[in-house]
Interface confidence: medium
């Protein structure tokens, strides 16, 4: 069973290497457990960046991942990826799985192209 | 690190709902542990159908999945998906990860379009 997942097409990371974007899904369905996975697509390769499971009680996610954070509210997840460098520029896809109770639904967004520009190194200040 | 994964573009499931296709990767690389994941892509959704890890000793995979089976030989996996119905028609991607020893390599095929036609129900024979 499929759900529709929407995410912005382009996001610019801050100079500190932080990119934030929402990931929304519909229909919201009556779900007690939602699994959100962020994947990075490069050519034909898909790499898992981070994943977490949200519940009604557990609305702050990615506690196991130092470079991802997220909050969950109804059918919207606000994602933040930090520690990004220019080499991390790429397409980041949000995958949403409505895990429980049945039926299982899954959807994947079209991806958010995150552009990261490395800051110029600061001159030594004596 | 990326590897190239090849799989046929189209396969027709049998009338019993069984589809078989090879998934090959190159370069083969000296690998003790290969993880193969079959994903189904529908529109922008990617669903994991089944996954298994092959080793030199464990060349028969997907024992945990009633609808997938596969055998592994060198750099080729012969995949079989059964229990398919017309609603399961879609693009099935083979993802290969060379897990161990380092370096980690990953690749994803372009997908095999599996067409499934439900058989006409047989008339009751008394």
């Amino acid at each position: 069973e499929a759900i529709q997942v929407t995410q912005p097409s382009v996001v610019l990371a801050s100079s500190h290497g932080v990119a934030s974007f929402p990931c929304e899904y519909s229909p919201s369905h009556n779900t007690d457990e939602v699994r959100v996975t962020v994947l990075r697509q490069t050519n034909d390769q898909m790499t898992e960046v981070c994943a977490t499971t949200f519940t009604e009680k557990n609305t702050v996610g990615f506690l196991d991942y130092p470079f991802c954070s997220g909050t969950f509210n109804e059918s919207r997840v606000n994602l933040t990826i930090q520690g990004l460098r220019a080499v991390d520029t790429g397409l980041y896809l949000c995958k949403v799985e409505l895990m429980y109770p049945p039926p299982y639904f899954v959807g994947m967004g079209n991806g958010t192209q995150i552009y990261v520009i490395d800051p110029e190194p600061c001159p030594d200040s004596d | 690190e990326a590897i190239q994964v090849t799989q046929p573009s189209v396969v027709l499931a049998s009338s019993h709902g069984v589809a078989s296709f090879p998934c090959e990767y190159s370069p083969s690389h000296n690998t003790d542990e290969v993880r193969v994941t079959v994903l189904r892509q529908t529109n922008d959704q990617m669903t994991e159908v089944c996954a298994t890890t092959f080793t030199e000793k464990n060349t028969v995979g997907f024992l945990d999945y009633p609808f997938c089976s596969g055998t592994f030989n060198e750099s080729r996996v012969n995949l079989t998906i059964q229990g398919l119905r017309a609603v399961d028609t879609g693009l099935y991607l083979c993802k290969v990860e060379l897990m161990y020893p380092p370096p980690y390599f990953v690749g994803m095929g372009n997908g095999t379009q599996i067409y499934v036609i439900d058989p006409e129900p047989c008339p009751d024979s008394d």
Epitope: T53, K57, M99 | -
Partner: antibody
């Protein structure tokens, strides 16, 4: 190979408590929701409770709500059922069963069961 | 009283075809949830026989088949054998009860 092994059954008096365990092996335990299903002597199957893979969501049949608590320890690959305020009608063989989720859920694998007898 | 309704018993002679029905409601089978069938041989745990309405796990003979229509489902066993003598249960998820529901079970007897 998937294996589910229940333990903790036995004879208990009405109003008493019992804790059942189900040791799982042969699969990634935390990826699967788990269930308890019971069968009274000579009767049919009755679903008792379910818990999602992370343990964040729990579900109970009306007949046990408020008395039974399902939990899991993913680090130990073990499922539990804490049964309090037991009644004679809770007498049954208790099975743990594993959900499948890839194309839809179903109870794919069952343990051999553990017998709980509530009697004075 | 089970949420899914099955006949309490069924019987047939070796080689015959028998069908076991399972009737539900709009909150389970009628809501689109798949029906699964379990076989329980005497003194053993239930074993998955049919999943997703009509799919057989590996190792289950093709003599067993399942179908679903509307709010009901059925299990057919052709070429009946003595080892098929067992209890058969249907199951589905029920979204109003937020749990699995079972049929009351059908005891299949192979005569002769």
């Amino acid at each position: 190979e998937v294996q589910l092994l229940e333990s903790g059954g036995g004879l208990v008096q009405p109003g008493g408590s019992l804790r059942l365990s189900c040791a799982a092996s042969g699969f990634t335990f935390s990826s699967y929701s788990m269930n308890w299903v019971r069968q009274a002597p000579g009767k049919g199957l009755e679903w008792v409770s379910a818990i999602s893979g992370s343990g964040g969501s729990t579900y109970y049949a009306d007949s046990v709500k408020g008395r039974f608590t399902i939990s899991r320890d993913n680090s130990k690959n073990t499922l539990y059922l804490q049964m309090n305020s037991l009644r004679a009608e809770d007498t049954a063989v208790y099975y743990c069963a594993r959900d499948r989720v890839e194309m839809n859920q179903w109870l794919a694998d069952w343990g051999q069961g553990t017998l709980v007898t509530v009697s004075s | 009283q089970s949420v899914l309704t099955q006949p309490p018993s069924a019987s047939g002679t070796p080689g015959q075809r028998v069908t076991i029905s399972c009737t539900g409601s709009s909150s389970n089978i009628g809501a689109g949830y798949d029906v699964h069938w379990y076989q329980q041989l005497p003194g053993t745990a239930p074993k998955l026989l049919i999943y997703r309405n009509n799919q057989r796990p590996s190792g289950v003979p093709d003599r067993f088949s399942g179908s679903k229509s509307g709010t009901s489902a059925s299990l057919a066993i052709s070429g009946l054998r003595s080892e098929d003598e067992a209890d058969y249960y249907c199951a589905a998820w029920d979204d109003s009860l937020n749990g699995w529901v079972f049929g009351g079970g059908t005891k299949l007897t192979v005569l002769g």
